[in-house]
Structure formats: structure tokens, C-alpha cells
Interface confidence: medium
């Protein structure tokens, strides 16, 4: 009864420049097989709770699972399978016609960088000429999912997209984020944040790709009409996006209340929890509705800002109205006003 929870289960993620994300392939008794996303009675477009695949990520020495669902581009190998029963079970699988199979993709968090990255393998820089145009977001090592420098591939050509700040491209960014299955556009990232600056430890081969693109039509509705090829620029910005599907999201909890549905709001920064400081941009119940939902409680009953008489009170600050828009938290080392939230308790 093989499942991805079993100690001897073998899997790999292919068709990306990282062992921690890509198309899921599993080793069964007769070799490697690509897993179709229609397996286990799912529809080919269905996204799953990724933490169910935590064992797969763990075996690959990657971090926590970030997304589990259809892979952006299906490259069908010789053998693809559809499996039946429960999600993650491989004891009852059948071979699938390649043209009927949409591959299942898994993205795990990149592990902490301990050695310089290897050079980019050929599939990324030279996709099959027959492959349809596709996009890729390249995050910095250990960076966020759905955040990074945009690379566009057409046939055997791939590269970054030249971007000028004055370009009015909001429609295009929404289209790109959506095409990457990363939700909607939130903001442009400076290149350092997107991880494009050359790391001194990086090998010379990991240089910008030899092709560059320019935005041709910011209202395009299919990838092949969005960009045109240009001579690579020595300087200038490249397009780097943060989409609403970025991971990891800010996690919250309520502490010090009489139940899990009330308390002072804390958020997680790495492995540390700290108080969330009040922010004038969050003076509406929207932020707290989101916090209540994350605790699996009902809607907000009340929230109150606690007095910050202590100049040394510290915490973390999110400048956006909703925590789900926060891809970074700032430390506040003084006058942090904590917020006490009471949500409706579904199990009073």
C-alpha cells in the first residue's frame, strides 16, 4: 500500500531549475512516472492543501510545501499515471494517455543556502523548441514563492524583461501573475529584493540569460503577443513582481485570551512570534477579520488598541491594511501598541 507517507517512497520534482519545485514524478516498481493532476478524483485544475505533501518535500531535503496543484506546463514523458483512492496513495494507479494528462506540480520552500548554487540545468535555459511560450518567476535562494524576477521563454529563447518605471503596465502585471498561477499583482520589487543581484559566491555561469525582452503590448491576452526580443541591456531594470499568491504568508495567532478566539495578536517572523503593532492603515475590521479567519473562528466581535505607555515595548509592524498583503514585516523597537481582538467562538 504505497503512499507518499511511506519511508521507502521515492519522488522527484522535474522540469524546473530547482529540486524543490516542479512536476511530480514517482518511482514505482517499473520506473519513474509523471503523476497526473487528475489523480485521486481531483479535477486537473484543483489546488490542494500543500501541507499534505510535507513528507515529499522533507525527503527531497526541501522546506515546507507551498503549493500542490496543476503544473504550469505539462511535459509528458514516456509514462504518466493517474492514481486512485486517497490523495497521496500510489497503490492503485493506471497508465494515462499522455494527451489526457495534466501534470501535478509541487513547490516546496528552498532550503537555506549553504553552498553556492549549481549552474542552471539545460531544461530551464533551453526548453524544447516545441514548448509553448511560458513564464517563470526566479526568486532569490530561500526567497518567496510568487515573488521574483520574471523570465519569459519562447521556443529555445529565454530571458528577463526590460522594464522602465514609467511603463504603465498594471494590466500586464495582473495578466502575468495570473498566468503564473500566483493570483493578482501587488507591487514591483527592486532587483535586490527579487534576488537578481549577483551573489559573490555564485559561479560565473549563473549570469543573466543571453536574451532579453521588451514589453510590446501591455494589454496582451496571450503570452506570445506580450514581448519582443531586444539586444540585452548592460544596465536598466528588469521586471520583478510580487503577486498576491506569495508564500510564505504572514501567520498570526491570538494569545492571552480566555479562548483561542481572543487575545493579543501576534505574528510570526521566521521562527519567532512577536506582537503585531497597531497601524493607522489597519484602522478597520478588515485586518482582524482575516486574523479571526486564520484562527478558524467566526467574524470579529471587537478589537481594541492597548496603551503603549512603555517606550520599550517592541513588536512587528505591517504597513498594509491586510496581513495577506504583507510580504515583509518591520521591527518596531519602541511604542508598539498591541491590539486585543475578540472573534466569535464557533465552539463557545
Amino acid at each position: 500500500r504505497l503512499s507518499w507517507y511511506d519511508p521507502d517512497f521515492q519522488a522527484r520534482l522535474t522540469r524546473s531549475n530547482s529540486k524543490c519545485q516542479g512536476q511530480l514524478e514517482v518511482y514505482l516498481k517499473d520506473g519513474w512516472h509523471m503523476v497526473c493532476s487528475q489523480s485521486w478524483g481531483r479535477s486537473s485544475k484543483q489546488w490542494e492543501d500543500p501541507s499534505q505533501a510535507s513528507k515529499v518535500c522533507q525527503r527531497l531535503n526541501c522546506g515546507v510545501p507551498l503549493s500542490l496543484g496543476p503544473f504550469l506546463v505539462t511535459y509528458t514523458p514516456q509514462s504518466s499515471i493517474i492514481c486512485y483512492g486517497q490523495l497521496g496513495s500510489f497503490s492503485n494507479c493506471s497508465h494515462s494517455r499522455n494527451d489526457m494528462c495534466h501534470s501535478l506540480g509541487l513547490t516546496c520552500l528552498e532550503p537555506q543556502k549553504t553552498t553556492p548554487p549549481t549552474t542552471r540545468p539545460p531544461p530551464t535555459t533551453t526548453p524544447e523548441p516545441t514548448a509553448p511560450p511560458r513564464l517563470q518567476l526566479v526568486a532569490q535562494s530561500g526567497g518567496q514563492h510568487c515573488a521574483g524576477v520574471v523570465e519569459f521563454y519562447s521556443g529555445s529563447l529565454g530571458g528577463t524583461i526590460s522594464y522602465e518605471a514609467q511603463d504603465k503596465t498594471q494590466d500586464l502585471e495582473n495578466f502575468l501573475c495570473n498566468n503564473l498561477q500566483c493570483g493578482s499583482f501587488l507591487k514591483h520589487l527592486p532587483e535586490t529584493e527579487a534576488g537578481r543581484a549577483q551573489d559573490p559566491g555564485e559561479p560565473r555561469e549563473h549570469q543573466p540569460l543571453p536574451i532579453q525582452w521588451k514589453i510590446q503590448n501591455s494589454s496582451c491576452t496571450s503570452l506570445e503577443h506580450c514581448f519582443r526580443k531586444i539586444k540585452p541591456q548592460k544596465s536598466g531594470r528588469v521586471l520583478a513582481l510580487l503577486c498576491s499568491g506569495f508564500q510564505p504568508k504572514v501567520q498570526s495567532r491570538l494569545v492571552g485570551g480566555s479562548s483561542i478566539c481572543e487575545g493579543t495578536v501576534e505574528v510570526r517572523q521566521g521562527a519567532q512570534w512577536a506582537a503585531l503593532c497597531d497601524s493607522s492603515s489597519a484602522r478597520s475590521s478588515l485586518r482582524w477579520e482575516e486574523v479571526c479567519r486564520e484562527q478558524q473562528c467566526g467574524s470579529v466581535n471587537s478589537y481594541r488598541v492597548l496603551d503603549a505607555g512603555d517606550p520599550t515595548s517592541r513588536g512587528l509592524f505591517c504597513p498594509h491594511q491586510k496581513l495577506s498583503q504583507c510580504h515583509e514585516l518591520w521591527e518596531r523597537n519602541s511604542y508598539c501598541k498591541k491590539v486585543f481582538v475578540t472573534c466569535q467562538d464557533p465552539n463557545p
Epitope: E48, D49, S51, Q52, S54, K55, C57, Q58, N61, C62, G63, V64, L87, L109, E110, P111, Q112, G142, P248, Q251, R253, R268, G270, A271, W273
Partner: nanobody, 120 residues
Framework: EVQVVESGGGLVQAGGSLRLSCAAS????????MGWYRQAPGKEREVVAA???????YYEDSVMGRFTISRDNAKGTLYLQMNGLKPEDTAVYYC??????????????WGQGTLVTVSS
């Protein structure tokens, strides 16, 4: 650091019920997914049931419909309700937690196990 401790094992007649509990302590908010595994004498450890953060569950075929896994995220407690027990369910039952450590890497935490004996 997360520690897990199982309880609730014991001797029961075939057809009877038991409820296993697993209490996690330490940084319980770093727990990603939790599961119950078992190891019968002379056999390999196998997964019985698992539950993700989002509440999605996985059951080994032979326990489907008889066992129910549940989890209280706030308390960091995992449960396994076992009904219709059979002699072949006799094993040491282990609690397992995947926890998030530095850099987002996962590490596994195991309990010492609790013995379940089903007599015919």
C-alpha cells in the same frame, strides 16, 4: 524544540474501542502536519493516519471507516479514535509531527509509542 508524548494505549477485546492522544509541547506553532504510525512485532513501521494543517486527512486502507484522526491545533494535541478493533491492529502506535525549523526545513519528531493489544 517540539516534543510529543502518546497516551491511551492498552488491552482491549476485538470489536472494542480505544482513543489515543498525542500531546505536543514546545514550539507547537511550528508543527506542519501530524500523523499516527504503528509497528507490529517483526514488521516495519507503517502510516495509519495523518492530518494536515488545513484539516485534510489520510487513512491507510485497512483502517478506513474504523479509525478517525483529529487534531486540536491550539493545544497541539492529536487524537486517534479507534473503533471496531481487530487483532491485526495490535502494535506500538507512534505519534509523528513534522515541524518547521530554521530556513523552513522540516524535521520529524517521534514519540516513544503506546502499546495497543487487541485480544480475540
Amino acid at each position: 524544540e517540539v516534543q510529543v508524548v502518546e497516551s491511551g494505549g492498552g488491552l482491549v477485546q476485538a470489536g472494542g474501542s480505544l482513543r489515543l492522544s498525542c500531546a505536543a509541547s514546545g514550539s507547537i506553532f511550528s508543527i506542519n502536519a501530524m500523523g499516527w504510525y504503528r509497528q507490529a512485532p517483526g514488521k516495519e513501521r507503517e502510516v495509519v493516519a495523518a492530518i494536515s494543517n488545513g484539516g485534510n486527512t489520510y487513512y491507510e486502507d485497512s483502517v478506513m471507516g474504523r479509525f478517525t484522526i483529529s487534531r486540536d491545533n491550539a493545544k497541539g494535541t492529536l487524537y486517534l479514535q479507534m473503533n471496531g478493533l481487530k487483532p491485526e491492529d495490535t502494535a506500538v502506535y507512534y505519534c509523528n509531527a513534522d515541524t518547521v525549523v530554521g530556513g523552513g526545513l522540516l524535521t520529524e519528531v517521534w514519540g516513544q509509542g503506546t502499546l495497543v493489544t487487541v485480544s480475540s
